[in-house]
Amino acid sequence: SAHAHPRDSCPLGPGRCCHLETVQATLEDLGWSDWVLSPRQLQLSMCVGECPHLYRSANTHAQIKARLHGLQPDKVPAPCCVPSSYTPVVLMHRTDSGVSLQTYDDLVARGCHCA
Amino acid sequence: SAHAHPRDSCPLGPGRCCHLETVQATLEDLGWSDWVLSPRQLQLSMCVGECPHLYRSANTHAQIKARLHGLQPDKVPAPCCVPSSYTPVVLMHRTDSGVSLQTYDDLVARGCHCA
């Protein structure tokens, strides 16, 4: 099969490889204070860390990328840590007609992989 | 809306920002010569280049990431250039019962964005 087994143990040491991390951000940090009312502070899960060879490969393409990066590091970048899924979050925001609740499906990461 | 307008013009100069690039790879390069018969060489489209602020943002999360990277570059990584879609490709490969054609949907990138 085209799929080599993606690795799940980090060869670089604890916390160094691609993982989910919580980042606190205020509405001011995000530049949203003029149109979002709540929450005033968001707990944003983001994907951080390195992607060593075959660690949490997103798919066949990522495995190829990892291999070719080993062969041609100047030409092919290493895979990088990006969201594999998202957690929906509700924001209370201003509209022309008042305020409303709106769900954002692509705002907070729920899982990460190397793509 | 949570979506600021993603930029499509590269502020870093031609060819520096996230884009699709073709990489030639042999079956030997990929470590596939023992199980894939054809094609003997693949034209692999891969996503390469940098992701400056709001360039080809994949979604709201990527826009937040770009903003927070500007505020906390040591804690929040910049968005990175990954496939937004794939082109299916067929491989002739060995199986226990002979050789057969199999389509891989996630092998060759067709478009790129910053995630």
Epitope: - | L37, P39, P88, V89, V90, L101, V108
Partner: antibody
Framework: QVTLKESGPGILQPSQTLSLTCSFS??????????VSWIRQPSGKGLEWLAH???????RYNPSLKSRLTISKDTSSNRVFLKITSVDTADTATYYC??????????WGQGTTLTVSS | DIVMTQSQKFMSTSVGDRVSVTCKAS??????VAWYQQKPGQSPKGLIY???YRYSGVPDRFTGSGSGTDFTLTINNVQSEDLAEYFC?????????FGGGTKLEIK
Amino acid sequence: QVTLKESGPGILQPSQTLSLTCSFSGFSLSTSGMGVSWIRQPSGKGLEWLAHIYWDDDKRYNPSLKSRLTISKDTSSNRVFLKITSVDTADTATYYCARTGWDFFDYWGQGTTLTVSS
Amino acid sequence: DIVMTQSQKFMSTSVGDRVSVTCKASQNVGTNVAWYQQKPGQSPKGLIYSASYRYSGVPDRFTGSGSGTDFTLTINNVQSEDLAEYFCQQYNSYPYTFGGGTKLEIK
């Protein structure tokens, strides 16, 4: 499940143009590596390859017939077409379309028979 | 054009026997040769790819061999359902060309 089915006029008179259609399912001609060929077989004789169209619209023809052949595709409707101009009695044959992945004809249609007669 | 020659138009064999169908290319085609089986009244069916690789689902009594200019399709333990015509084909260069076919008759 991959299937291909040829359709054509059945009978033509000499000098007319033959239009063949290959309707297929179970694969896409937008997949890199895929192609469809037309092959013919006069009754009781061998196989003659006529033309090939690749996923990227690259086309190849048998040089002995090239001036008379036109192959084309409609990827969205899963059809491949072949036109042969100025048919003659020598074009009487069963016409097959076949799927290829990297040059191997792994699935064939049932064939459509053409008789050229005045 | 590359000419593929199957010198034996007919071969006669018995159930349980082993038979070898040969094919000669007019120039070197590497291993870019396929074999097809056509039963009476049916369309051809792929048997062998790249000279020696059996296509998925093809019984293992069918084996292909050869490279360069000389190729062989061997059928071990011939069965009555193997009554068919066998064609070789080169895909080393355009135009693709087929051999003239070898009809296998079961005694």
